[in-house]
Interface confidence: medium
């Protein structure tokens, strides 16, 4: 939704205000692995980077593994995703308020290249899971998110039978499947090489753009 | 601009099929799943089933399993559901409706009113 | 696997009120809700955790809690008198359910 980032007026190069995001973008020379994308402009630490790496991080205690051991090519996305979560300083156009224990602000309908969720759904959707959205419904009792009674672990494809029940339905609709391909400078890409720059600063600004905020 | 437009209205006879068409625009079609949901006159909605407009896979409700069949032509852009068996219960206003996660439905088409009459 | 919603609610003008839907799919899934108006296809009013799609005014929320789902409308207008309907994902069998529908009466 165009105008989710209604409290905010920078938009640009902006963090959000969440559980483990610097409060103002910079450097960060060791962003880890995956993160790495991100270290010439980031809100995100070194450490946090590191964590999230992890197979139930102690930045949120969620366990990928929930249904079994997620494969390697579909868990990468899910890093990757993170990655995107923690560390971009460019979605302040999909900054959206919220009323949560954990965090004050949330991404909603951030637009993500089409190829990124494709191949995001056709990397997973042979793992296992119990849930089709995965903010709601778990079962926290022993700290780690469990499947709750009831909840059959069952292919990817099953909970998320298209890429965009995946994209759009796994965190509530932080992302929207763009119409737009990588390089277009009109999707977010999950996705980049930092040797030609971060292209989401350029979607960022288009966005901001649109809405008449500078 | 996202759009779903729907074939015009039927008449049928008991024991006839009727097919519907649902063509979309304005999206990328295969990335998202089509739904139909019916609603007789007076009465509240009703899901009939979704396919799958990327691969293809279908999945019906109980109560029309057996009578309903839903398919999609990509290069058209376009998804159908076709009921059997009619009878005069099946008189109803039929959507299609895009889902952006799972039940949730953000693009519907204008509908297509259904009338079984001898 | 049901949805129940009130037939009937209503509000004066400006005022508030709350259409809720239960059901056992709702502890594990968020509900949608749907304005539809006579002789008019259904609208997507929120859907997910708390989401409003671009054209939806601020005066629509929704929440959840357990098994319950409410639609809060804050300031009803007369525009809003129309039929509510919730739905959600049945996650067993990959269905989707819908409640029986609110007709809200704006006084």
């Known amino acids: 939704t165009m105008c989710s980032a209604q409290d905010r007026t920078d938009l640009l190069n902006v963090c959000m205000d969440a559980k483990h995001h610097k409060t103002k973008p910079g450097p960060e020379d060791k962003l880890h692995d995956q993160c790495s994308p991100w270290k010439k402009n980031a809100c995100c630490t070194a450490s946090t980077s590191q964590e999230l790496h992890k197979d139930t991080s102690r930045l949120y205690n969620f366990n990928w593994d929930h249904c079994g051991k997620m494969e390697p090519a579909c868990k990468r996305h899910f890093i990757q995703d993170t990655c995107l979560y923690e560390c971009s300083p460019n979605l302040g156009p999909w900054i959206q308020q919220v009323n949560q224990s954990w965090r004050k602000e949330r991404f909603l309908d951030v637009p993500l290249c089409k190829e990124d969720c494709q191949r995001w759904w056709e990397d997973c959707h042979t793992s296992h899971t119990c849930k089709s959205n995965w903010h709601r419904g778990w079962d926290w009792t022993s700290g780690v998110n469990k499947c709750p009674a009831g909840a059959l672990c069952r292919t990817f494809e099953s909970y998320f039978p298209t890429p965009a029940a995946l994209c759009e339905g796994l965190w509530s609709h932080s992302y929207k499947v763009s119409n737009y391909s990588r390089g277009s400078g009109r999707c977010i890409q999950m996705w980049f090489d930092s040797a030609q720059g971060n292209p989401n600063e350029e979607v960022a600004r288009f966005y901001a753009a649109a809405m008449h905020v500078n | 601009e996202v759009q779903l437009v729907q074939s015009g209205a039927e008449v049928k006879k008991p024991g006839a099929s009727v097919k519907v068409s649902c063509k979309a625009s304005?999206?990328?079609?295969?990335?998202?799943?089509m739904h139909w949901v019916r609603q007789a006159p007076g009465q509240r909605l009703e899901w009939m089933g979704w396919?799958?407009?990327?691969?293809?896979?279908?999945k019906y409700s109980q109560k029309f399993q057996g009578r309903v069949t839903i398919t999609r032509d990509t290069s058209a852009s376009t998804a159908y559901m076709e009921l059997s068996s009619l009878r005069s219960e099946d008189t109803a206003v039929y959507y299609c409706?895009?889902?952006?996660?799972?039940?949730?439905?953000?693009?519907w088409g204008q509908g297509t009113l259904v009338t079984v009459s001898s | 696997m049901e949805l129940t919603q009130d037939p009937a609610v209503s509000v004066a003008l400006g005022q508030t009120v709350r259409i809720t839907c239960q059901g056992d799919?709702?502890?594990?899934?968020?509900a949608n809700w749907y304005q539809q108006k006579p002789g008019q296809a259904p609208v997507l009013v929120i859907y997910?955790?708390?989401n409003r799609p671009s054209g939806i005014p601020d005066r629509f929320s929704g929440s959840s809690s357990g098994n319950t789902a409410s639609l809060t409308i804050t300031g009803a207008q007369a525009a809003d008198e129309a039929d509510y309907y919730c739905?959600?994902?049945?996650?067993?069998?990959?269905?989707?359910?819908f409640g029986g529908g609110t007709k809200l009466t704006v006084l």
């Open positions: 739905d959600s994902r049945v996650s067993t069998g990959n269905h989707v359910v």
């Open positions: 396919i799958n407009a990327g691969n293809g896979n279908t």
């Open positions: 997910g955790q708390n």
């Open positions: 799919s709702l502890r594990s899934n968020y």
């Open positions: 409706a895009r889902d952006i996660s799972y039940g949730s439905f953000d693009y």
């Open positions: 304005g999206y990328t079609f295969t990335s998202y799943a």
